[in-house]
């Protein structure tokens, strides 16, 4: 079948999800497409525990996550509800800053060097994290 019961090579398993950490950079949309071609998505952070796990693996480096407001409201790429979900923004962020001189504001979220989140220009070539969930079918305990 098409069920994913274990993580692909070079991916890290954690709490029934698989994570892949880039060591090179891409613009947010290109990173998003890369993850999609891996049958995954940019990482969606749903808890403080998951935040700590990702932060441990990426270190103090700007890294894209699967959160953006390119169409207005902030949205997670997998449909997780933003308003009621976990957030870890830096103080006074997101600010949709226009002063960078690159045109437009800031529509894509990334982990900063201390792990807290900032919104930034989506074209910046940051590292990224892909995530894919292990199939629910494979999470059922075996029948005895």
């Amino acid at each position: 079948g098409s069920e994913r019961t274990c993580c692909p090579v070079n991916w890290v398993e954690h709490e029934r999800s698989c994570y892949w950490f880039s060591r090179s950079g891409k613009a947010w949309a290109d990173a998003d497409n890369y993850c999609r071609l891996e049958d995954a998505h940019l990482v969606v952070v749903t808890s403080w525990e998951e935040q700590k796990f990702v932060q441990h693996h990426i270190g103090p480096v700007n890294t894209w996550m699967g959160l953006h407001d390119q169409n207005g409201p902030w949205k997670w790429v997998d449909g997780t509800d933003y308003e009621t979900g976990f957030k870890n923004w830096r103080p006074e962020q997101p600010d949709d800053w226009y002063g960078h001189g690159l045109g437009g504001g800031e529509d894509c979220a990334h982990f900063t060097d201390d792990g807290r989140w900032n919104d930034d220009v989506c074209q910046r070539p940051y590292r990224w994290v892909c995530e894919t969930e292990l199939d629910k079918a494979s999470q059922e305990p075996p029948l005895l």
Partner: antibody, heavy 121, light 107 residues
């Protein structure tokens, strides 16, 4: 030996349809994204489309968007390209290719021998 | 879309020559650049990925360098089997565009 074998090419009239197949062997097909690339006679290579390993994501060149559909059947280790509303400029050798990703760097490492599609009245 | 250009479009060289082929991207593609070799009537063959990494089984006379927008493929000592066309391709962004190719023929 890892192998890709295309089939389904031929002569078709403008506006017609054709379905290309690419049979994969000797690798775990569902673990790899797959792509179609074409080459018009005497011309260079043109990327056409790509599909993820489990088929959940697909992408297309603007020149074929809305007319071509990439799909796969992992139970049959086969990649497909459904081509509708064909035009003379779609005349080319069509190659399927396996995508690899090494530390975030993508490349196409295994290619089929190609199948010729001719669109002419 | 990212446009890729190559120069020269063709070149004539002799066995033993050192050959350089240049590929340029219309915007930065960092190091997401591939080189292929193609012989008439055959499928492309992967030579180089990630701008400078040699694909397994490719002779060490092939090397490549570059980052950002400018890239070079070098054949240190041209062999008879190297007469072919060479294409670059960027995988920074979809669509994964190719350069127009460089044909290397016998002088």
């Amino acid at each position: 030996e890892v192998q890709l074998l295309e089939s389904g090419g031929g002569l078709v009239q403008p506006g017609g349809s054709l379905r290309l197949s690419c049979a994969a062997s000797r690798f775990t097909f569902s673990s790899y994204a797959m792509s179609w690339v074409r080459q018009a006679p005497g011309k260079g290579l043109e990327w056409v489309s790509v599909i993820s390993g489990r088929g959940g994501s697909t992408f297309y060149a603007d020149s074929v968007k809305g007319r071509f559909t990439i799909s796969r059947d992992n139970s049959k280790n086969t990649l497909y390209l459904q081509m509708n509303s064909l035009r003379a400029e779609d005349t080319a050798v069509y190659y399927c290719a396996r995508r690899i990703a090494v530390a975030g760097n993508e490349a196409f490492d295994i290619w089929g021998q190609g199948t010729m599609v001719t669109v002419s009245s | 879309d990212i446009q890729m250009t190559q120069s020269p479009s063709s070149l004539s060289a002799s066995v033993g020559d050192r050959v350089n082929i240049t590929c340029r991207a219309s915007q930065s593609i960092i190091s997401y650049l591939i080189w292929y070799q193609q012989k008439p009537g055959k499928a492309p063959r992967l030579l180089i990925y990630a701008a400078s990494s040699l694909q397994s089984g490719v002779p060490s006379r092939f090397s490549a360098s570059g980052s950002g927008t400018d890239f070079t493929l070098t054949i240190s000592s041209l062999q008879p089997e190297d007469f072919a066309s060479y294409y670059c391709q960027q995988t920074n962004s979809i669509p994964f565009t190719f350069g127009p190719g460089t044909k290397v023929d016998i002088k």
